[in-house]
């Protein structure tokens, strides 16, 4: 047969040769020839390549910069990049997690629907009728109004989304 024009999976075409790609964790040193195999070398410390490749340089592991609120969630290997996450109380600003911002607090009248993680911000929701939040918090949900009836009390002041009801004793004259 004549030299190929297309190659198998995990191969690449160069100078009419189908050469083996380098496996993840290794970089290309020299292309194969009619008489020799592709030559690959392992990536160095703090480097990686995560695919079958013909790269002549490995990629540097991501640096989790503490000055940006980042810390290492998973240490990189020769085949995987380092995964960064944010310090407690902070979350990533993007999917790539290149910097962190402080978790948002839910204002009075709003409660926490979903607590923030290292990669997602706090999700707040307005307190519905029957619930309130009187604090600015990144953790507190909307609390239900106090049930005066269960305490044998009556509502003296109606609750709002920011305040609880105020209960008081029953009016004895109406008894």
């Amino acid at each position: 047969p004549e030299p190929p024009t297309a190659c198998r999976e995990k191969q690449y075409l160069i100078n009419s040769q189908c050469c083996s790609l380098c496996q993840p964790g290794q970089k290309l040193v020299s292309d194969c020839t009619e008489f020799t195999e592709t030559e690959c070398l392992p990536c160095g410390e703090s480097e990686f390549l995560d695919t079958w490749n013909r790269e002549t340089h490995c990629h540097q592991h991501k640096y989790c910069d503490p000055n940006l609120g980042l810390r290492v969630q998973q240490k990189g290997t020769s085949e995987t990049d380092t995964i960064c996450t944010c310090e407690e109380g902070w979350h990533c600003t993007s999917e790539a997690c290149e910097s962190c911002v402080l978790h948002r607090s839910c204002s009075p009248g709003f409660g926490v629907k979903q607590i923030a993680t290292g990669v997602s911000d706090t999700i707040c929701e307005p307190c519905p009728v029957g619930f309130f939040s009187n604090v600015s918090s990144a953790f507190e949900k909307c609390h239900p109004w106090t049930s005066c009836e269960t305490k044998d009390l009556v509502v003296q002041q109606a609750g709002t989304n920011k305040t609880d009801v105020v209960c008081g004793p029953q009016d004895r004259l109406r008894a």
Partner: antibody, heavy 112, light 112 residues
């Protein structure tokens, strides 16, 4: 077009060192490939002697024991063969080759 | 070492007829990647060897398609579909899977 050209003395005395140089044009010897020396005694078959790689490392035929050295001069795009303590049995046509391209060969006679 | 044994050593052929040369290795020439580095060369009288086939079955550029190579493991064959007068010469197999590289003894093709 890749071309290889051997040069060196055609006559060497027994026990002396045979020295040949191969000049390569049309391709850098540091880019890729293994650069070989192959010899052929008169009327006989081919014998691989050794190579120097694009990165400067070597491999030799164990049959030549410790007599063989292949080196290179990257500034001149040349690689060289030295074979010490020669005898009449080393009389041969010596080829330098990339294997897909060969020099025309040079006859070296070992005789006093 | 991988010992390469060619047969026949002499091959008289009628012009226009096919010719076949066998090359056997004392060990498998398939490497860990599944590639086999077995080559065929033609050497005409007074000339340097010329690459015909590399990696068992790939024709080198400029080689007529009447030349073909096949085989695997330890058994390999060079075929000429219809011999022409210019095909006269000695044919060598060469393995470069294992160091030292080793040639077969050569097969002399002549016209009957």
């Amino acid at each position: 077009q890749v071309q290889l050209q051997e040069s060196g003395p055609g006559l060497v005395k027994p026990s002396e060192t045979l020295s040949l140089t191969c000049t390569v044009s049309g391709y850098s010897i540091t880019s890729n490939y293994y650069w070989n020396w192959i010899r052929q005694p008169p009327g006989k078959g081919l014998e691989w002697m050794g190579y120097i790689r694009y990165d400067g490392s070597n491999n030799y035929n164990p049959s030549l024991k410790n007599r063989i050295t292949i080196s290179r001069d990257t500034s001149k795009n040349q690689f060289s063969l030295k074979l010490s303590s020669v005898t009449a049995a080393d009389t041969a046509v010596y080829y330098c080759a990339r294997l897909d391209y060969w020099g025309q060969g040079t006859l070296v006679t070992v005789s006093s | 070492d991988a010992v390469m044994t060619q047969s026949p050593l002499s091959l008289p052929v009628t012009l226009g007829e096919p010719a076949s040369i066998s090359c056997r290795s004392s060990q498998s020439l398939e490497n860990t990647n599944g590639n086999t580095f077995l080559n065929w060369f033609q050497q005409k009288p007074g000339q340097s060897p010329r690459l015909l086939i590399y990696r068992v079955s790939n024709r080198f550029s400029g080689v007529p398609d009447r030349f073909s190579g096949s085989g695997s493991g330890t058994d390999f064959t060079l075929k000429i579909s219809r011999v022409e007068a210019e095909d006269v010469g000695v044919y060598y197999c060469l393995q470069v899977t294992h160091v030292p590289f080793t040639f077969g003894q050569g097969t002399k093709l002549e016209i009957k």
